[in-house]
C-alpha cells in the first residue's frame, strides 16, 4: 500500500510532492490563521487551478483541465490549512503550483513542485524463439525512464538491450536477454528512482527430470526469502509450454486463498501452500507431458520464475507392445 503522496521539504517556501499517475494527491499549504481568507492555487503562474474567497469556491475561471479534480479541506481552512486535494494526477500535471493565501493579517505565497511517477507492475517472461531462449523484463508504463540491471548468478551483466517506446504519458520498456543453453540463474531489477520503487524478476532453471510413462512427477517451487513477504498479495501460476506457448495448469491467489486447477491430473498440497511451498504433483504421466514447466510467483514487487524440464519416456510395457 502506497501513501497518497509524499513530501520533500526544501528551502524558500517550496516543497516537492511526488504523486502516482491516476492517483490522488495533496498539495500542502499552511498559513497563520486569520479572517477574510482568500486562497488562489495557480499552475506555472498562469493557469487557475482553484480559487476560494468570501467563504466559498469560485471556479468560474478555473482552467478546464482541473474541472472536478480539485477541492480544499473546507473544515480546516479556519485552522490555517490551504492544502489542495487533487484527484487523478496525470503527467501533464507536473510542474510548479503556487498557493496564494490572503487574510486580514497578511499575504503569503507557497510554492509546491509536483512530480508524477508511473510504475505499472513489470513482468518477467520466458520465451522461446525458434531454437533460442529469452528472458524478457518488461514494464508497460513507467515514468521517468527506469534503471534496468541484469545479474547472472548474482554477478552484474553489462550487456543490457533496452527496447523503448515512448507515449505521451510514459515509457514502455522491454529488456530481452538471450539465455540459450544456460543453466545459470538470472535476476532483473527495474528501479523507478522518483517513486523509490524497485521490482525484481528472478529466473531459475532446475535440473531436468526423467520419468517413465504412468509415473507421477513432483516439481518444486518455493519462493526465495529475500523477496517473499507472505503478508503481501501474490499470485502463483503453474503452466506448461507446448509448441512455443504456455498453457496454464493451475493458479493460486493469496488474497482469496483460492486455487483454480485446469488439469485434472495436477495436484497441490494445501498444507505446503500454507507454508509457502507451491510445489506440485502431476499424476499418470504420458509422453505428451514432456516439456518445460514454469512456476511463476508474482507480486507488485517481484516475479520469481522456476523452470523444470520433464522428459517422459515410454515404460518397458509400452516399448515391448511396439
Amino acid at each position: 500500500i502506497f501513501p497518497l503522496a509524499f513530501f520533500i521539504y526544501v528551502p524558500m517556501n517550496e516543497q516537492i510532492v511526488i504523486g502516482r499517475l491516476d492517483e490522488d494527491i495533496i498539495l500542502p499549504s499552511s498559513f497563520e490563521r486569520g479572517s477574510e481568507v482568500v486562497i488562489h492555487w495557480k499552475y506555472q503562474d498562469s493557469y487557475k487551478v482553484h480559487s476560494y474567497y468570501k467563504g466559498s469556491d469560485h471556479l468560474e475561471s478555473q482552467d478546464p483541465r482541473y474541472a472536478n479534480r480539485t477541492s480544499l479541506f473546507y473544515n480546516e481552512i479556519q485552522n490555517g490549512n490551504a492544502s489542495l486535494f487533487f484527484r487523478r494526477v496525470s503527467l501533464l500535471d507536473e510542474g510548479i503550483y503556487t498557493c496564494y493565501v490572503g487574510t486580514a493579517i497578511q499575504v503569503i505565497t507557497n510554492k509546491v513542485v509536483l512530480k508524477v511517477g508511473v510504475f505499472l507492475t513489470p513482468v518477467m517472461k520466458y520465451e522461446k524463439r525458434n531454437t533460442n531462449s529469452f528472458l524478457i523484463c518488461s514494464v508497460l508504463s513507467v515514468y521517468p525512464r527506469p534503471i534496468i540491471t541484469w545479474k547472472m548468478d548474482n554477478t552484474p551483466i553489462s550487456e543490457n538491450n533496452m527496447e523503448e517506446t515512448g507515449s505521451l504519458d510514459s515509457f514502455s520498456i522491454n529488456s530481452p536477454l538471450n539465455i540459450t543453453g544456460s543453466n545459470s540463474s538470472y535476476e532483473c531489477t527495474i528501479e523507478n528512482s522518483l517513486l523509490k520503487q524497485t521490482w525484481t524478476g528472478r529466473w531459475t532453471m532446475k535440473d531436468g527430470l526423467h520419468k517413465m510413462q504412468s509415473e507421477h512427477v513432483s516439481l518444486s517451487c518455493q519462493p526465495v526469502n529475500d523477496y517473499f513477504s507472505p503478508n503481501q498479495d501474490f499470485k502463483v501460476t503453474w503452466s506448461r509450454m507446448k509448441s512455443g506457448t504456455f498453457s496454464v495448469l493451475a493458479y493460486y491467489l493469496s488474497s482469496s486463498q483460492n486455487t483454480i486447477i485446469n488439469e485434472s491430473r495436477f495436484s497441490w498440497n494445501k498444507e505446503l501452500i500454507n507454508q509457502s511451498d507451491f510445489s506440485m504433483n502431476l499424476m499418470d504421466l504420458n509422453l505428451s507431458d514432456s516439456g518445460e514447466y514454469l512456476c511463476n510467483i508474482s507480486s507488485d514487487e517481484y516475479t520469481l520464475l522456476t523452470i523444470h524440464t520433464v522428459h517422459v519416456e515410454p515404460s518397458q510395457e509400452t516399448a515391448s507392445h511396439n
Epitope: 482568500v38 488562489h40 468570501k54 490572503g102
Partner: antibody, heavy 121, light 107 residues
C-alpha cells in the same frame, strides 16, 4: 506605511482620453488587488474597476466597461487607468484603493488622496 | 446591480449620543458589507468589514451588525471627531455598490 499616490488628473474635453496613474509603496504591491473608486463633486462613491494581484483578472463597472482599461506593472509598483471616450458624467475625484488581499474580497482598506478629472467642453 | 439604501441621509446628534445608521440591500448580501467614514476633503477610511468586524486601529465605539439585507452602523458615544459622511458598501458581487451616504452633523 502604506501609501497610494494618484496622478494624471486634469481638464479634458468630452470624447478625449486621459491616463491616470497610482504609485504604491509601503507594501508588497504584487500581493494585492487594487481598485479605482470615483466620487463626483458633492456626490457619493462609485466603484470603477479592480485588477487582481497578478494582473490577470480585471472587472469593471457597467458605466465604464469598454471605455476604461485598468492595468498594472508589478515591477514598478504602479497602477494605471486608461480612460477613453470620456463623458461629462465621468467628472470626479478618482481614488486608487487597495483591496484586503488579492482583489477578490472587494472592499477598500487603504486609499490614495485622489486626483480630480474634469470633463468639460 | 445590487442597490444600497442608507437612512437617514442627514443626522444631527450631540456629543455622547448613541448614533445608529441603517443600510438596506436590494437583495441578500450575506455579511459582505463594509462601512467607511469620509471627512470633508479627505479620502474615505475603512471602519467595519464583514458587517461586524472592526478594522484595526478604529476606535471601539464603532460597531456594525446585521446580515442578509438589513445592516446598522452604531457609534456608542459620539465624539466631535466623528463629524463625517458615512457610507455602506456591498462586496457580495460585482459591481460593488455604495449607499448614497449619511452626513453626520454635531449639534
Amino acid at each position: 506605511q502604506v501609501q497610494l499616490v494618484e496622478s494624471g488628473g486634469g481638464v479634458v474635453q468630452p470624447g478625449r482620453s486621459l491616463r491616470l496613474s497610482c504609485a504604491a509603496s509601503g507594501f508588497t504591491f504584487s500581493d494585492y488587488g487594487i481598485h479605482w473608486v470615483r466620487q463626483a463633486p458633492g456626490k457619493g462613491l462609485e466603484w470603477v474597476a479592480v485588477i487582481w494581484y497578478e494582473g490577470s483578472d480585471k472587472y469593471y463597472a457597467d458605466s465604464v466597461r469598454g471605455r476604461f482599461t485598468i492595468s498594472r506593472d508589478n515591477s514598478k509598483n504602479t497602477l494605471s487607468l486608461q480612460m477613453n471616450s470620456l463623458r461629462v458624467e465621468d467628472t470626479a475625484v478618482y481614488y486608487c484603493a487597495r483591496d484586503r488581499s488579492s482583489g477578490a474580497m472587494g472592499y477598500f482598506v487603504y486609499w490614495g488622496q485622489g486626483t480630480l478629472v474634469t470633463v468639460s467642453s | 446591480d445590487i442597490q444600497m439604501t442608507q437612512s437617514p441621509s442627514t443626522l444631527s446628534a450631540s456629543v455622547g449620543d448613541r448614533v445608529t445608521i441603517t443600510c438596506r440591500a436590494s437583495q441578500s448580501i450575506s455579511s459582505w458589507l463594509a462601512w467607511y467614514q469620509q471627512k470633508p476633503g479627505k479620502a474615505p477610511k475603512l471602519l467595519i468589514y464583514k458587517a461586524s468586524s472592526l478594522e484595526s486601529g478604529v476606535p471601539s465605539r464603532f460597531s456594525g451588525s446585521g446580515s442578509g439585507t438589513e445592516f446598522t452602523l452604531t457609534i456608542s458615544s459620539l465624539q466631535p471627531d466623528d463629524l463625517a459622511t458615512y457610507y455602506c458598501q456591498q462586496y457580495n458581487s460585482y459591481s460593488y455598490t455604495f449607499g448614497q451616504g449619511t452626513k453626520l452633523e454635531i449639534k
